[in-house]
C-alpha cells in the first residue's frame, strides 16, 4: 500500500477582504480511516481552524459534503475574510483512535487577505502659519494588506518632494498603517490652493484613494496698509483713509489714533472675498482741521488675526488751513466704516499708492 | 468519545408501529452516516437502513422499504427508527452505528433496542 | 444484490492456533483500488465491533493478532493466535453497493 498523501495543491491563496477563500486540500487515500482537521499556524501554538468531526466553526464549510461515500476531498470555504485571518493553514489527517491520532500533515496554505487601505486623512498644523513659511502636512491610511503601497503628494496638482513617508509595521503583520508628512511652502497665493494626499493600492483597482487639506485652514496673509488723505473738503473737513489689502483670513480690527490717542476701533466682518480668497477693506476718518492749532499725526493700528499690530501713520498739516470758530469738534465719527467702499477686488496696484 | 446511547426495551402487538431513538454524542451529528441493523435472536445481522442527518437522504433494504422510516433531529442529535405492521418475527435487538468513515460500514454502534413483538 | 457467504459456520481452535475464516461475494466488491469488505467480532449480549475495514486495514485498538486479507471476491480474516477472549461471532460486511452482512461464523476454543 502506498503511503497516504495530504495534497495542498496552492502554496498561497490571496483574497479580498470580505470574500470567501476557499483552502483546497486532498488525500490520497482512504486508508486510514480518520477525520481531517485544519489548523492556522504550525506547532503546539496552531488554532484550529475546523473539525469535520467535531465542533461548531460558523465560517468554515466543508467545500464536498464530507457524508459522501468515500470522499477524499477536505477543501474548505471561510466565508467574510478579514485581515485578521491571514496566515497559513495546514490540512491535518488523524487516525480514527480514542483519541484520534494526527497522522500527517498537508504543506501548509498561505492566505493573503487584500484589504483595502481607509480614506486618507489629511491634517495640517495646529496654528495658522504665515505667507512664505513652511508648514508640515500629514496624510495617514491604516487596515491595507499587503504592506506595498505608493503615496504621492500634491500641490494644486503639482507633485510635491519634500515628502517623508512610513509603512508600519516593518515586519509581518495582518494589515498595516501608513503615515507621510510634506514639508509645504505657503505664498500669498495658496488662499484656494489645496494639498492632495493620493494613495495607491493593488486593491483599488488603479483607482487611487485621495484626501485633501485646504490651505486655506493653514495660511495667514498679512495685509499691506496704506493711509492717504482726500482733497480737503468746503467745511474745512479731511477724509484720511486707510486701506487695508490682500489679507487672510478675515479675523482683523482696526484702531484710528489721533496724536497717540485712540479714536476708534472697528472689527472687519462680512467682507467681500477678492478672486485670490483673500480681502480688502477702507476705513476713513473725517478730521476738522480747524480745530486743531498743530499738525495731526493720525495713525491706522491694524491688528491680523491674532498677530502683533502692524502701524501706518500719515500726518494732517493744519498750518496751511485757517481756523473757523465755534468749532469743538476735532474729528467726526461718521461715514468711517464703509464695508461696500472696497471695490478693488484683485486689481493688484490701484491701491498701492504708499505714502511713508 | 463516540456515544450512541438507545431507548429501551419495547413489547409491541402484531399490526402495531415501534419508534427507536438513538441520541449521538461527542461528534458533530450532521457529518457521518447512521445506520440500522437488526439481530433476531440467535440469529444474524441484518441491515436495515442508512440517514445523513445533514440531509435527510436515506437508503433502504429493499425488505424493508415499505414498513420503516428512518427520521433525525438535528437539535438534539437523534435519529430515530420506525418500524410499522410488526410481525412476530420482527422480534429483534435494534442497533444504530454510525459510519465514521463514509465508507458504509458501522465503526460505532449503540447497545441495542430490543423490541418483542407478541400477541 | 450481493450475497456474502461466510465458511465455515462454526469453528473450534485451540488457544495459541490459527484461526482462519472465509467470505465469498457473489460478485466483486472491489472499486477503484479498494476493498469494501468489513469484519465485525460480536461477543454474547454485545452490539459487533469493527475489526477490519477495507479489507485489510485494522481498526485501531485491534490487537494486531487479527489480520485480512483478499481481493475481488474472497475474502479471510485470521487470528494467528488464538485467545480466550476471541470467542465471538465473526461477520463480515460489504458496502460495494447498499451493504449487507454474511451470515456469521461462530469461532470457540476447542
Known amino acids: 500500500e502506498e503511503e497516504l498523501q495530504v495534497i495542498q495543491p496552492e502554496k498561497s491563496v490571496s483574497v479580498a477582504a470580505g470574500d470567501s477563500a476557499t483552502l483546497n486540500c486532498t488525500v490520497s487515500s482512504l486508508i486510514p480511516v480518520g477525520p481531517i482537521q485544519w489548523f492556522r499556524g504550525a506547532g503546539p501554538g496552531r488554532e484550529l481552524i475546523y473539525n469535520l468531526k467535531e465542533g461548531h466553526f460558523p465560517r468554515v464549510t466543508a467545500v464536498s459534503d464530507p457524508t459522501k461515500r468515500n470522499n477524499m476531498d477536505f477543501s474548505i470555504r471561510i466565508s467574510n475574510i478579514t485581515p485578521a485571518d491571514a496566515g497559513t493553514y495546514y490540512c491535518v489527517k488523524f487516525r480514527k483512535g480514542s483519541p484520534d491520532v494526527e497522522l500527517k500533515s498537508g504543506a501548509g496554505t498561505e492566505l493573503s487577505v487584500r484589504a483595502k487601505p481607509s480614506a486618507p486623512v489629511v491634517s495640517g498644523p495646529a496654528v495658522r502659519a504665515t505667507a512664505e513659511h513652511t508648514v508640515s502636512f500629514t496624510c495617514e491610511s491604516h487596515g491595507f494588506s499587503p504592506r506595498d503601497i505608493t503615496l504621492k503628494w500634491f500641490k494644486n496638482g503639482n507633485e510635491l518632494s519634500d515628502v517623508q513617508t512610513n509603512v508600519d509595521p516593518a515586519g509581518k503583520s495582518v494589515s498595516y498603517s501608513i503615515r507621510s508628512t510634506a514639508r509645504v511652502l505657503l505664498t500669498r497665493r495658496d488662499v484656494h490652493s489645496q494639498v492632495i494626499c493620493e494613495v495607491a493600492h493593488v486593491t483599488l483597482q488603479g483607482d487611487p484613494l485621495r484626501g485633501t487639506a485646504n490651505l486655506s485652514e493653514a495660511i495667514r496673509v498679512p495685509p499691506f496698509l496704506e493711509v492717504t488723505q482726500q482733497s480737503m473738503r468746503a467745511d474745512n473737513q479731511v477724509n484720511v483713509t486707510c486701506q487695508v489689502t490682500k489679507f487672510y483670513p478675515q479675523r482683523l480690527q482696526l484702531t484710528w489714533l489721533e496724536n497717540g490717542n485712540v479714536s476708534r476701533t472697528e472689527m472687519a466682518s462680512a467682507l467681500p472675498e477678492n478672486k485670490d480668497g483673500t480681502y480688502n477693506w477702507t476705513s476713513w476718518l473725517l478730521v476738522n482741521v480747524s480745530a486743531h492749532r498743530d499738525d495731526v499725526k493720525l495713525t491706522c493700528q491694524v491688528e491680523h488675526d491674532g498677530q502683533p499690530a502692524v502701524n501706518k501713520s500719515f500726518s494732517v498739516k493744519v498750518s496751511a488751513h485757517p481756523k473757523e470758530q465755534g468749532s469743538n469738534t476735532a474729528a467726526e465719527n461718521t461715514g468711517t466704516n464703509e464695508r461696500g467702499s472696497s471695490d478693488y477686488k484683485d486689481d493688484d496696484d490701484k491701491h498701492h499708492h504708499h505714502h511713508h | 468519545q463516540v456515544q450512541l446511547v438507545q431507548s429501551g426495551a419495547e413489547v409491541k402487538k402484531p399490526g402495531a408501529s415501534v419508534k427507536v431513538s438513538c441520541k449521538a454524542s461527542?461528534?458533530?451529528?450532521?457529518?457521518?452516516?447512521i445506520n440500522w441493523v437488526r439481530q433476531a435472536p440467535g440469529q444474524g445481522l441484518e441491515w436495515i437502513a442508512m440517514i445523513d442527518p445533514s440531509d435527510s437522504e436515506t437508503h433502504y433494504n429493499q425488505i424493508f422499504k415499505d414498513r420503516a422510516t428512518l427520521t433525525t433531529d438535528t437539535s438534539t442529535s437523534t435519529a430515530y427508527m420506525e418500524l410499522r405492521s410488526l410481525r412476530s418475527d420482527d422480534t429483534a435487538v435494534y442497533y444504530c452505528?454510525?459510519?465514521?468513515?463514509?465508507?458504509?460500514?458501522?465503526?460505532?454502534w449503540g447497545r441495542g433496542t430490543l423490541v418483542t413483538v407478541s400477541s | 444484490d450481493i450475497v456474502l457467504t461466510q465458511s465455515p459456520d462454526s469453528l473450534a481452535v485451540s488457544l495459541g492456533e490459527r484461526a482462519t475464516i472465509n467470505c465469498r461475494a457473489s460478485?466483486?466488491?472491489?472499486?477503484?483500488?479498494?476493498?469494501?469488505i468489513f469484519w465485525y467480532q460480536q461477543k454474547p449480549g454485545q452490539p459487533p465491533k469493527l475489526l477490519i475495514y477495507?479489507?485489510?486495514n485494522l481498526d485501531p485498538g485491534v490487537p494486531d493478532r487479527f489480520s485480512g486479507s483478499g481481493s475481488g471476491t474472497d475474502f479471510t480474516l485470521t487470528i494467528s493466535s488464538l485467545q480466550a477472549e476471541d470467542v465471538a461471532v465473526y461477520y463480515c460486511?460489504?458496502?460495494?453497493?447498499?451493504?449487507?452482512f454474511g451470515q456469521g461464523t461462530k469461532l470457540e476454543i476447542k
Open positions: 477495507l479489507a485489510s
Open positions: 452505528a454510525m459510519d465514521y468513515g463514509s465508507l458504509y460500514a458501522m465503526d460505532y
Open positions: 460478485k466483486s466488491v472491489s472499486s477503484s483500488g479498494y476493498n469494501y
Open positions: 460486511q460489504h458496502s460495494r453497493e447498499l451493504p449487507t
Open positions: 461527542g461528534y458533530t451529528f450532521t457529518n457521518y452516516w
